[in-house]
């Protein structure tokens, strides 16, 4: 290993700010990739990494292209992937990522799905459908032209699917309220049966959201199909057209036919033989996680390593598993000392600094490098759509036809033990998705199932129950749940969406934008009730006052969690109230706080940790 001129941070609680985002990945995936990349170093050295929301951060993370505000311009697709500055003030310590790259998890473009039966899981490329391999979304097996993909490697075996971003599901911005395109539609007296750039000079594809634009003037922009946007060839930035004809044969996905190098390509018109328009299909992309882990190594003071297996080696290669080599560990520990592993039993209180958790032992990722082998020199730059960044996505309510089938719609009664995906026994669950007190019983949610814990002798534990039977609109994975003690309405949160149940009636999903929470808030960790009609809403180390009636946060009220609750983990993933105490969960553990919810003003003497324990042993009373 080599260090950089002896430079290192003079403190061990490092802060970082994600200044902007790439369009290649959903924001929550980008947040997660960076958090995991920091955690790699936090695992082996006594460093903590706290996300903050301003330029006072030690490490400012930025996506940029070409000349982007420093003296070290990027170079377009491939080549230089990212760069970082050594520790210090100002731009020193910052990490910049070249947004002309395709950022992924290292295994191809990440396409979120809608509807279907996979709860928004990303497409898995390639996937097999009816014995054929697909490397992009397809309309095969459907007669309505809506592109879909499998969310596992084999649709034929698993039957898991979702719909790809498509104008047949929704449009973005414009004035069509996010409604899908209506095809055909009339524009300037002419009929259009696909998105068009006609009438625009900026090249954005749009459509009418009614049958007649000339009459109704309602429109939206068509979502970008990143899975099918070609690079290189003679049509860079255009979309693959499926099916297309090549040498008289029809292709419904990218192919390497006709090439000796095995690279996948597609036609950008329906007939290559006549039009000769083509481009390369998106490649595997670069793992944002691994490139970031490498760059953060630089930002912490490590120079390049001469050990080819090291994360800090200057060449990019694909890798799965924990990315650090002994040389990397020696280097970071030379700078900051050896890391101490946490005690299996949690301490009575914890600091307010982040305690990064270990990354998964097998993460689909790759290590970074400054100069990988050069691929196509031209790549789409991806023009941003005009208007706001979030877009509603209403879609078809009916079940999809021939291709993948929708899951059966379940009844709304609590159905007890059917075949369960987690363990039948909640005592075997490491970390629950969400815990909440609902109708006097503590509910433990995991992977689309839940258990009820009634705090009395006899048989206190009931379940498992299928979440979708009791609350039909909910996704399988929840971040948190909360019952309003006054109205008994139940709030559920998953990602950037919220559902509110009054009995069996649901309102939602609603975007967190509607609550007054900006795009940097990627999930809600929990709510704690306050005085009448008010609550505290938590997310990633911050807390807001929340009006349960208007369902809005007070944006001026945001403060750090440790300002009101000292000694709880800053990155608690689930926060709930039970028997008039507040519980902050992190990993297998909870931190219990004596919480005064009647008073208007927080009593700092009261909001103190009074117990730390195991969720399973101490709350669920597992043996």
């Amino acid at each position: 290993f080599q260090t950089f001129k002896g430079l290192k941070w003079d403190h061990h609680n490092i802060t970082y700010w994600i200044q902007n985002y790439s369009e290649d990945l959903p924001r929550d995936m980008i947040d997660d990739a960076f958090a995991r990349a920091f955690a790699v170093w936090g695992e082996v050295a006594p460093l903590t990494f706290t996300r903050v929301y301003g330029p006072e951060a030690d490490i400012v993370i930025q996506f940029g292209v070409a000349e982007h505000g420093d003296g070290y311009p990027f170079d377009g697709k491939d080549g230089l992937l990212a760069h970082a500055f050594p520790p210090g003030a100002g731009v020193q310590g910052d990490a910049h990522f070249d947004d002309d790259e395709l950022w992924s998890l290292g295994k191809g473009v990440v396409i979120p799905t809608y509807y279907g039966n996979s709860n928004g899981a990303p497409c898995h490329f390639p996937f097999t459908f009816e014995g054929r391999s697909y490397s992009a979304c397809t309309t095969d097996g459907r007669n309505d032209g809506t592109p879909w993909c499998s969310t596992t490697a084999d649709y034929d075996k698993d039957g898991k699917f979702g719909f790809c971003p498509s104008e047949r599901l929704y449009t973005e911005h414009g004035n069509g309220e996010g409604k899908p395109c209506v095809f055909p539609f009339i524009f300037e007296g002419r009929s259009y049966s696909a998105c068009t750039t006609k009438g625009r000079s900026d090249g954005y594809r749009w459509c009418a959201t009614t049958a007649n634009y000339d009459q109704d003037k309602l429109y939206g922009f068509c979502p970008t199909r990143v899975d099918a946007t070609v690079v290189g060839g003679n049509s860079a930035g255009e979309l693959c057209v499926f099916p297309f004809v090549f040498l008289g044969k029809q292709y419904s996905s990218c192919t390497s036919d006709g090439r000796r190098d095995g690279r996948l390509w597609c036609a950008t018109t329906s007939n290559f033989d006549t039009d000769k328009k083509w481009g390369f299909c998106p490649d595997q992309g670069y793992s944002l996680f691994l490139v970031a882990a490498h760059e953060f190594g630089h930002a912490l003071g490590l120079d390049h390593s001469s050990v080819p297996e090291a994360l800090m080696y200057p060449l990019y290669s694909y890798l799965e598993g924990f990315p650090l080599n002994k040389d990397d560990i020696d280097g970071i520990q030379y700078l900051y000392g050896r890391g101490s592993k946490p005690d299996p039993r949690p301490p009575a209180t914890t600091t307010t600094e982040p305690q990064p958790t270990a990354p998964p032992t097998m993460c689909p990722t790759i290590p970074p490098t400054a100069y990988p082998t050069v691929g196509p020199t031209v790549g789409p730059t991806g023009a941003p759509s005009p208007g706001p960044t979030s877009s509603p996505s209403p879609g078809p309510t009916g079940a999809p036809s021939p291709g993948p089938t929708a899951p059966p719609t379940a009844g709304s009664s609590e159905a007890s033990t059917e075949s369960l995906s987690p363990a039948d026994n909640p005592c075997n669950v490491d970390v629950f998705d969400a815990i909440a007190e609902i109708q006097g019983a503590l509910h433990f949610f995991k992977d689309g199932w839940y258990w009820k814990f009634l705090n009395h002798r006899g048989s206190p534990l009931q379940g498992p129950f299928l979440t979708a039977r009791t609350w039909p609109a909910l996704p399988a994975t929840l971040d948190s749940a909360f019952e309003d003690p006054q109205t008994k309405r139940v709030f559920f949160f998953s990602g950037r969406q919220m559902w509110v149940y009054t009995g069996k009636t649901v309102l939602g999903p609603r975007s967190l934008d509607k609550l007054g929470l900006g795009p940097e808030v990627t999930h809600v960790s929990g709510l704690l009730p306050r005085r009448l009609g008010k609550a505290l809403l938590f997310s990633k180390g911050r807390v807001w006052r929340f009006d349960l009636k208007s369902q809005k946060v007070d944006p001026q009220s945001v403060i750090r969690v440790d300002k009101e609750f000292s000694g709880v983990p800053w990155n608690s993933h689930d926060i709930f109230q039970y028997q008039d105490k507040a519980y902050f969960c992190h990993g297998k553990f909870f931190w219990r706080v004596s919480f005064q919810n009647e008073v208007n003003k927080v009593d700092h003497e009261v909001n103190q940790v009074d117990d730390v324990g195991y969720v399973t042993y101490d709350l669920l009373q597992c043996p």
Partner: antibody, heavy 124, light 107 residues
Framework: EVQLLESGGGLVQPGGSLRLSCAAS???????PMWWVRQAPGKGLEWVS?????????FYADSVKGRFTISRDNSKNTLYLQMNSLRAEDTAVYYC?????????????????WGQGTLVTVSS | DIQMTQSPATLSLSPGERATLSCRAS??????LAWYQQKPGQAPRLLIY???YRATGIPARFSGSGSGTDFTLTISSLEPEDYAVYYC?????????FGQGTRLEIK
């Protein structure tokens, strides 16, 4: 020992062309950005052009954009500057220089090795 | 482009004296500044990189300081071989730019 050796300078008429070469040795040429810097007689230093290691990205001063082309052949450890449509104000000693910074760690600022320079005179 | 202004244009000092050369950037460049020495008929030689780090083989009498917009090159005790033209160069923003130079001459 690191060495940079420029060649290809000389006298040329306005509108003419020249191709400068810079032969590098003593370091891993393919890892480093390379630069051309010029100095008009009795004047200061002026950046002309630079190229990234793979050759995939090139940069030019406004005064030469569209007329000069920088390139490199990593297999020959050689840097080039093709100069077309030369003007009298292009008269200078042209130096090639090696960047201290390489790869994605951008703290090293400065050109740690320079060639001895080659004189380009544009005159009728 | 960032303008780099060096002062004074000429500095006349005797051997053994302390020389202080100044370089000012038109906007902040953090510590992305290098100093070069150039003698007649020779190529420039890197003295200081990143504002304060001596390049390989540079004597300890040369030191650099400063951050942001104001930078100084100091030669603690002038030796006969130090008389030359000194240039500063920034890389805090693109494109890189050089100062116009300070001529250090024997008094």
């Amino acid at each position: 020992e690191v060495q940079l050796l420029e060649s290809g300078g000389g006298l040329v008429q306005p509108g003419g062309s020249l191709r400068l070469s810079c032969a590098a040795s003593g370091f891993t040429f393919s890892l480093y950005p390379m630069w051309w810097v010029r100095q008009a007689p009795g004047k200061g230093l002026e950046w002309v052009s630079s190229i990234y290691p793979s050759g995939g990205a090139t940069f030019y001063a406004d005064s030469v954009k569209g007329r000069f082309t920088i390139s490199r052949d990593n297999s020959k450890n050689t840097l080039y500057l093709q100069m077309n449509s030369l003007r009298a104000e292009d008269t200078a000693v042209y130096y090639c220089a090696k960047d201290r910074a390489y790869g994605d760690y951008v703290g090293w600022n400065g050109f740690d090795y320079w060639g001895q320079g080659t004189l380009v005179t544009v005159s009728s | 482009d960032i303008q780099m202004t060096q002062s004074p244009a000429t500095l006349s000092l005797s051997p053994g004296e302390r020389a202080t050369l100044s370089c000012r950037a038109s906007q902040s460049i953090s510590s992305f500044l290098a100093w070069y020495q150039q003698k007649p008929g020779q190529a420039p030689r890197l003295l200081i990189y990143d504002a304060s780090y001596r390049a390989t083989g540079i004597p300890a009498r040369f030191s650099g300081s400063g951050s942001g917009t104001d930078f100084t090159l100091t030669i603690s005790s002038l030796e006969p071989e130090d008389y030359a033209v000194y240039y500063c160069q920034q890389r805090g923003n693109w494109p890189i730019t050089f100062g116009q130079g300070t001529r250090l001459e024997i008094k």
